[in-house]
């Protein structure tokens, strides 16, 4: 028996592993139960490199770094193993493999092909009531890339290296309580030996990893504190899970898109004392010149007179006062700004290159879309029309699930909306606001969400440089008003930009992502 | 070609045990269930139970159960058929056949070993 | 478990009659229904799986049709090697079952 601790916070991933099996023993059947209670997940795991997702699009089988081994046929069941319930699930035609899988012989062939090869450098496959056929080579068949949208919806053809998620039948109708198997058929290789799991009544509705012997839960809160224990043949893991309980500050921040206000906040912090520091570095140096401009004016040079003690002649003119040196003066306001802004930019309105990093670096998703990843997309490229439920699906307010360029997504027929649109990505943490399940896809959350809140930067830069300028030019002298350096248009081409990319009623950019997309890391 | 090669026949006393084997080859032995049938002398085929050597699944007969194991060697492409507290009902030639691939509805039997016969005498 | 029963249990036939030997299975299997041949002191022989799919080596005289819980095998012309053992197999479901057997004559 073995015993661990496991202290996190609240809104971070539970990583519950379960002891390994003995090496040379054939992988035991795990049984996750929690707190005293009867089992709520049972698992057969498969070999290395799977995993299964339970959430909103139901149970998911994850396939990691497919390669040329993993094509082939992949069967499933509500059911377990031991029951003959098995249908089609998908077939899985890894490119450059030199093999291609087909339920139908019919989605083998273009027109006038008949049902002969798909290409003269691969070998297709056809699923023959219940183990697959080689079938013959055609003579005249099209090019490969024409044929691939013929297949029907339930034909994968993946790049190697990219992971794919199959469901047991077709969101929303696929399998999402369990139990349920699944088998892979490969007519020439050694099958992949391929997860079963039940999902029992104590099981919690929430999002769920199974990877292997480790049990990972997204997004912990306070309910998932407790003891989970994981039996695997005769050893026990106990697992104690603490969680700390954030502040509701916190819970607020990660409803207003999670690290993008903070991050946001700082960096307009940051442009704010720079702004300042630049303000009065200027006005410094405008001061200097201003009083050295009027000490050595002719027309305005005078000189104090201080009569003599003593002496009843007075003179109007006497002793001439020095002029100040740069050096002179406020040097205490010059020392602070020296150490602030010693790289300060210059009093301007710099939100613009924020804007268009920002921008840039939400364009340069990884994966972003099947069309950029050809052939890596679940469907085949041109099959937009035929799928109900691929990455090349027309409605754009649904995420690709897909990783690495394969996957699935919800039917057409019923489009989620922006509250459904949980992404995926490499970083650490899972946000899931509404607490419902969703795969991962490759897609990074925006740097600058139009959700936020509709602050304008480039307005509170002018008032606070404004306020700073009018507050200190009482303590010192009147001097003409300060003018930007930038001239005006642009500098409010520049604020309106800005607001308009942040506005939270105007038009999604292309670019967004939209909602309120978490990420997570398969890594 | 698909071959299933089992061993020779067995004598044994009543109240012991017997393991017999059958050996593959011609195909890829983990990815085909192994089929176990016995047939009592004069008498028709009785389904045993089967195993799928890529996870060591197995399936039994009910009446089997408690009598009969099914393992399998995947270094050596061999399943066996262990039968435990014997009696003279257990008399029988014991066939095995490969079945269908694991996650499929293959249920028939192409392929058979020549059988081994096993002989529960006092 | 399914209970399959085949009849008659024993047939006796000239070569080159046609022959029908039946199958009935205690509740419906759709056609989940195999057939095998037994020579004396062989091996079982697929002749037919599914009810009535052909098997590649098997000469074109075996037949079979059927589907639910009612099932044939049809031999159209007997010859002398067709002697022996026939079985129906039920593969709809754990435990797979077999029928009694028709015992195959040659007169």
């Known amino acids: 028996q073995k015993l661990l601790q496991v202290e996190m916070e609240e809104g971070s991933d539970a990583v519950l592993p379960c002891l390994q099996d003995p090496p040379d023993g054939p992988p035991e059947r795990l049984i996750w139960s929690r707190d005293s209670q009867g089992p709520f997940l049972e698992l057969s795991p498969g070999s290395p490199g799977l995993g299964i997702h339970v959430g909103r699009l139901g149970i998911l089988l994850l396939i990691f770094n497919v390669s040329n081994e993993m094509g082939g046929f992949y069967l499933c069941q509500p059911a377990p193993p031991s029951q003959q319930a098995w249908q089609p699930g998908w077939t899985v035609s890894v490119e450059g493999s030199g093999e291609l899988f087909r339920w139908n012989a019919s989605d083998l062939g273009g027109p006038g092909c008949g049902l002969g090869n798909e290409s003269s450098s691969s070998q297709p496959y056809v699923w023959d009531r219940d183990h697959p056929k080689e079938w013959d080579m055609g003579p005249a068949c099209a090019s490969p890339r024409g044929d691939l949208n013929q297949s029907s919806s339930l034909d994968l053809t993946v790049a190697p290296g990219s992971t794919v998620w199959l469901s047991c039948g077709v969101p929303p109708a696929s399998v999402a309580t369990g139990p349920v198997s699944w088998a892979h058929i490969h007519p020439t290789k050694p099958n992949i030996l391929l997860p079963s799991l039940n999902l029992t009544a104590e099981s919690p509705a929430r999002e769920m990893w199974v990877l292997g012997p480790v049990l990972m839960l997204p997004q912990v809160t306070a309910v998932d504190a407790g003891m989970y224990v994981c039996r695997r043949g005769n050893l026990t893991t106990e697992i104690h899970v603490t969680i700390t309980v954030r502040p509701a500050i916190w819970h607020w921040l990660q409803r207003k898109s999670g690290w993008i206000v903070p991050v946001v906040a700082l960096l307009y912090l940051i442009f704010c004392l720079g702004c300042l520091v630049s303000f009065l570095h200027l006005r410094r140096a405008l001061i200097l010149r201003r009083k050295r401009k009027r000490m050595t004016d002719p027309t305005r040079r005078f000189f104090k007179v201080t009569p003599p003690a003593g002496n009843g002649a007075q003179s109007q003119y006497g002793n001439v006062l020095s002029l100040p040196t740069p050096t002179s003066g406020t040097g205490r306001a010059q020392r602070w700004a020296a150490s602030l802004g010693g790289a300060a930019a210059p009093y301007g309105h710099p939100l613009s290159d924020v804007q268009e990093a920002g921008a840039a670096g939400s364009r340069s998703l990884p994966r972003a879309s099947p069309e950029e990843e050809e052939g890596e997309a679940y469907e085949e490229p041109d099959s937009e029309a035929d799928s109900e439920f691929y990455e090349n699906d027309s409605n754009p307010a649904q995420d690709q699930l897909s990783q690495d360029g394969s996957g699935y997504e919800n039917p057409e027929e019923e489009p989620s909306g922006p509250e459904d649109d949980d992404s995926f990505s490499n970083a650490e943490s899972y946000e899931n606001e509404d607490e419902e399940l969703a795969p991962p896809v490759t897609r990074t959350a925006d740097f600058l969400s139009p959700h936020g809140s509709a602050w304008d930067p480039s307005r509170e830069a002018v008032s606070l440089g404004s306020q700073s300028y009018e507050d200190m030019r009482g303590i010192l002298y009147a001097a003409p008003q300060l003018r930007s350096s930038r001239p005006g248009p642009s500098y409010e081409e520049d604020a309106d930009s800005y607001e308009n990319m942040d506005n939270p009623d105007g038009p999604e950019p292309a670019w967004g992502a939209g909602g309120h997309g978490g990420t997570w890391s398969t890594r | 070609q698909v071959q299933l090669q089992q061993s020779g026949p067995e004598v044994v006393k009543p109240g012991a045990s017997v393991r017999m084997s059958c050996k593959a080859s011609g195909y890829i032995f983990t990815n085909h269930y192994i089929h176990w049938m016995k047939q009592r002398p004069g008498q028709g085929l009785e389904w045993v139970g089967c195993i799928y050597p890529g996870n060591v699944n197995s399936n039994y007969n009910e009446k089997f159960k408690g009598k009969a194991t099914l393992t399998a060697d995947k270094s050596s492409s061999t399943a066996y058929l262990q039968l435990s507290s014997l009696t003279s009902e257990d008399s029988a030639v014991y066939f095995c056949a490969r079945g269908g691939y694991y996650g499929s509805s293959y249920s028939w039997f192409a392929y058979w070993g020549q059988g081994t016969l096993v002989i529960v005498s006092a | 478990d399914i209970v399959m029963t085949q009849s008659p249990a024993t047939l006796s036939v000239t070569p080159g009659d046609r022959v029908s030997l039946s199958c009935r299975a205690s509740?419906?299997?759709?056609?989940?229904l195999h057939w095998y041949q037994q020579s004396s002191h062989e091996s079982p022989r697929l002749l037919i799986k599914?009810?009535?799919q052909s098997i590649s080596g098997i000469p074109s005289r075996f037949s079979g049709s059927g589907s639910g819980s009612d099932f044939t095998l049809t031999i159209n012309s007997v010859e002398p090697e067709d002697v022996g053992v026939y079985y129906c197999?039920?593969?709809?479901?754990?435990?797979?079952?077999f029928g009694g057997g028709t015992n195959l004559e040659i007169k």
């Open positions: 509740q419906s299997i759709s056609d989940f």
């Open positions: 197999q039920n593969g709809h479901s754990f435990p797979y079952t």
């Open positions: 599914y009810a009535s």
